[in-house]
């Protein structure tokens, strides 16, 4: 079964090595999740040809997936640590419902999908400890999430494949942007 960073023998600190700092732990955690997304994308891409499609061809969808923008303060230009951290946490909280949707979408990578979901929850906790301005973080309404989940699960097979692909790609991009920003903090 997939393990969280720190649980496998390779990640256990050697007797004389320094324990991971909070930033290093977060960095390692994001890289672990990205590896998981890569594995899930492989299964998705083997099932359909959507991975070859350009972004424009897939842009017309009703999903409101979190996305980094200049105003969020996470880019090199206009970088703002506090604003960016709030965006990362808020975005991850918004992705949670989509990660729940992914849970029944994989056959051979079912455990990997669960590991991505669980380690994202842990990542949110790590980041919340790091954030100063927790009041600015908005948590999605459970009822809104429940109805969105129902709606996504009611789609036809082709749309569900498309949704799966878009969620994985958007989540990957969001995490990569987050990692770049966190490495500047």
């Amino acid at each position: 079964a997939p393990v969280l960073p720190g649980e496998d023998s390779k990640d256990v600190a050697a007797p004389h090595s320094q324990p991971l700092t909070s930033s290093e732990r977060i960095d390692k955690h994001i890289r672990y999740i990205l590896d998981g997304i890569s594995a899930l994308r492989k299964e998705t891409c083997n099932r359909s040809n959507m991975c070859e499609s350009s972004k424009e061809a897939l842009a017309e969808n009703n999903l409101n997936l979190p996305k980094m923008a200049e105003k969020d303060g996470c880019f090199q230009s206009g970088f703002n640590e506090d604003t960016c951290l709030v965006k990362i946490i808020t975005g991850l909280l918004e992705f949670e419902v989509y990660l729940e949707y992914l849970q029944n979408r994989f056959e051979s990578s079912e455990e990997q999908a669960r590991a991505v979901q669980m380690s994202t929850k842990v990542l949110i906790q790590f980041l919340q400890k790091k954030a100063k301005n927790l009041d600015a973080i908005t948590t999605p309404e459970p009822t809104t999430n429940a109805s969105l989940l129902t709606k996504l699960q009611a789609q036809n097979q082709w749309l569900q494949d498309m949704t799966t692909h878009l969620i994985l790609r958007s989540f990957k991009e969001f995490l990569q942007s987050s990692l770049r920003a966190l490495r500047q903090m």
């Epitope: 990205l34 350009s54 972004k55 996470c74 991009e173 942007s177 770049r180």
Partner: antibody, heavy 120, light 110 residues
Amino acid sequence: EVQLVESGGGLVQPGGSLRLSCAASGFSLSNYYVTWVRQAPGKGLEWVGIIYGSDETAYATSAIGRFTISRDNSKNTLYLQMNSLRAEDTAVYYCARDDSSDWDAKFNLWGQGTLVTVSS
Amino acid sequence: AIQMTQSPSSLSASVGDRVTITCQASQSINNELSWYQQKPGKAPKLLIYRASTLASGVPSRFSGSGSGTDFTLTISSLQPDDFATYYCQQGYSLRNIDNAFGGGTKVEIK
């Protein structure tokens, strides 16, 4: 065939501007990170800047405020707008693609380069 | 800002020699380092990424090792086609840096 082709290089006066193009064929540019790297005559490689999938950009300190990377997905082309050019910007400019499947930047497909000469 | 220091800047070697080039980062970059080969008048070619993973089509005589701040590119038995300039490149962070590449190592015929 999967390839990148740069164009737009030439002779420009100090203080002038130039726009380089990088045309992609055989793949959709919007799915990848693309970077610009330059090489002054007889010198080593110097990273200039990168554009990520989300149109996020990052630049080397020498390029900040003077150079801008953008793309036109409908033309499958990347651009490097260079302003306030100096003699030390004289170099062969390469565009290169990163497959963006991971978090670290690595460039596995390169164009042939275009020469920019800044001189009066 | 992360800086990459490569050494030596040049070396002379014979066909069949074992060649080692080192690259040092000014701070830890995990294993997020690539190696490139460049021949005169040509674009660079990716040899190794993630410090030790061979890029597609690269001969197995090339190998990479290291993690954190210290990295090595080794050519186990130098071939005529290997005389070129080699560059390391950090892919850890491309923000607020002067250059992502090391200064290069020119491998010449002895």
